[in-house]
Interface confidence: low
């Protein structure tokens, strides 16, 4: 806390300029009017203040706006944003995408911080949903942003926003998130032709149900093994050997290398060994010839 001291004669700041870098902390406190600072915040960034001096400037703004800064000030915070705590940011009402971009730019190249996370939360909650422009902005700065949202939060993403999503944006998504995103992607890309559709939908297929995988197997898509390994196990299990062969096309040979890993391992256990042998890959572990396969899940559902 800086003590209140009178401003020395002739030192009262008329504007925010470079002369202030020679002011001691107490002089900044005493000689810079908070209202002047608020109206000339855009100049602060161009002046090489020390961290200690920035602390004083923040303190002045905090006193002027105890309920939270107005957006006109927030937009021009620049490096002063790095001095804000999540508690400070929770008081803000940020509605302009330009403000969000300006602050994200300050943090560019750094890891996502609690301050930025709080800022984004405040912004998205204020908007009510993740529109395409917001999603474009956030994923440009933080490719992992989409996968940081809970399934409940993702449900507010409109299908139109899905066009902004790049494959790398989904790298850290887990199955529950893809369950929410996949139907939106299906809707967003529904008017595309076969091969173009597959290119777009491929990253979302970790949320696809069996029926959709069966449909894809009829379209010569040649799914790669990396995509296949990310499919839901429960969606893969009902696929026949012929369907998997069609789905993977020339990549079917890759099943051998993955035979001990899910979902391939569990799928093998559900297939007749005779059918697996038709692939000529030496896959082992299928149901031996002459064994009867009971669908216990159907029995459980009836009981």
């Amino acid at each position: 806390e800086v003590e209140k001291t009178a401003c020395p004669s002739g030192k009262k700041a008329r504007e925010i300029d470079e002369s202030l870098i020679f002011y001691k902390k107490w002089e900044l406190e005493a000689c810079v009017d908070a209202a002047l600072l608020a109206t000339q915040m855009d100049r602060v960034n161009a002046i090489p203040f020390t961290y200690e001096q920035l602390d004083v400037l923040k303190h002045k703004l905090d006193e002027l706006y105890p309920q939270g800064y107005p957006e006109s000030v927030i937009q021009h915070l620049g490096y002063l944003f790095l001095k804000m705590s999540p508690e400070d940011i929770r008081k803000w009402n940020v509605t302009s995408l330009e403000t969000l971009k300006a602050l994200l730019e300050v943090n560019k190249g750094h890891e996502m911080s609690p301050q930025v996370a709080t800022l984004i939360d405040r912004f998205v909650k204020g908007r009510g949903q993740l529109d395409k422009d917001t999603l474009d902005t956030l994923t440009a700065f933080y490719p992992g942003y989409l996968c940081s949202l809970s399934p409940e939060e993702l449900s507010s993403v409109p299908p139109s926003s899905i066009w902004a999503v790049r494959p790398q944006d989904l790298d850290t998504c887990d199955p529950r998130q893809l369950d929410v995103l996949y139907p939106k992607a299906r809707l967003a890309f529904q008017n595309m032709n076969g091969s173009e559709y597959f290119v777009k939908i491929q990253s979302f297929l970790g949320g696809a149900p069996t029926e959709d995988l069966k449909a894809l197997s009829q379209q010569n898509v040649s799914m790669d093994l990396a995509t296949f390994m990310k499919l839901r196990t429960d969606a893969v299990l009902p696929l026949t050997v012929a369907e998997v062969q069609k789905l993977l096309g020339p990549h079917v040979e890759g099943l051998k290398a993955e035979e001990r890993h899910r979902p391939v391992r569990d799928w093998i256990l559900r297939q007749r060994q005779d059918d697996l042998d038709t692939l000529g890959l030496g896959l082992q572990g299928g149901i031996p010839n002459g064994y009867l396969v009971l669908d216990l899940s159907m029995q459980e559902a009836l009981s």
Epitope: M112, A117, C147, S148
Partner: nanobody, 125 residues
Framework: QVRLVESGGGSVQAGGSLRVSCLVS????????VGWFRQAPGKEREGVAA????????YYADSVKGRFTIAQDYAKNMVYLQMNSLKPEDTAMYYC??????????????????WGQGTQVTVSS
């Protein structure tokens, strides 16, 4: 692949202190919960403490409140559990767990998708 690696642990006398650490790789660190769970022989795995990295909010089980402190070091991707005033009943395997899809945290085991291998903590009387 997301990995969580615990370190620390060991043996200590009742009333002593220990710190266990968790290195978190490839979590979406800024919206994740990282929690510490423990499992004593023959008992269910229970939640001990969790931290939400988005805001630094912390959560504790009643049995450890005031004795254990969870903290994060953002730059190093580390989460620490400082355990003071240890009791024999704190003896257990301690596991670090994480999830990248939360908007808040808790100590419900099913909410955590990623788990470490565990580190043993033994408190003798």
């Amino acid at each position: 692949q997301v990995r969580l690696v615990e370190s620390g642990g060991g043996s200590v006398q009742a009333g002593g202190s220990l710190r266990v650490s968790c290195l978190v790789s490839k979590l979406t660190a800024w919206r994740s919960c990282v929690g510490w769970f423990r499992q004593a022989p023959g008992k269910e795995r229970e939640g001990v403490a969790a931290i939400y990295s988005g805001t630094g909010s912390t959560y504790y089980a009643d049995s450890v409140k005031g004795r254990f402190t969870i903290a994060q070091d953002y730059a190093k991707n580390m989460v620490y559990l400082q355990m003071n005033s240890l009791k024999p009943e704190d003896t257990a395997m301690y596991y670090c767990a994480g999830t990248s899809i939360r908007s808040s945290c808790g100590l419900v085991r099913d909410e955590y998708a990623y788990w470490g291998q565990g580190t043993q903590v033994t408190v003798s009387s």
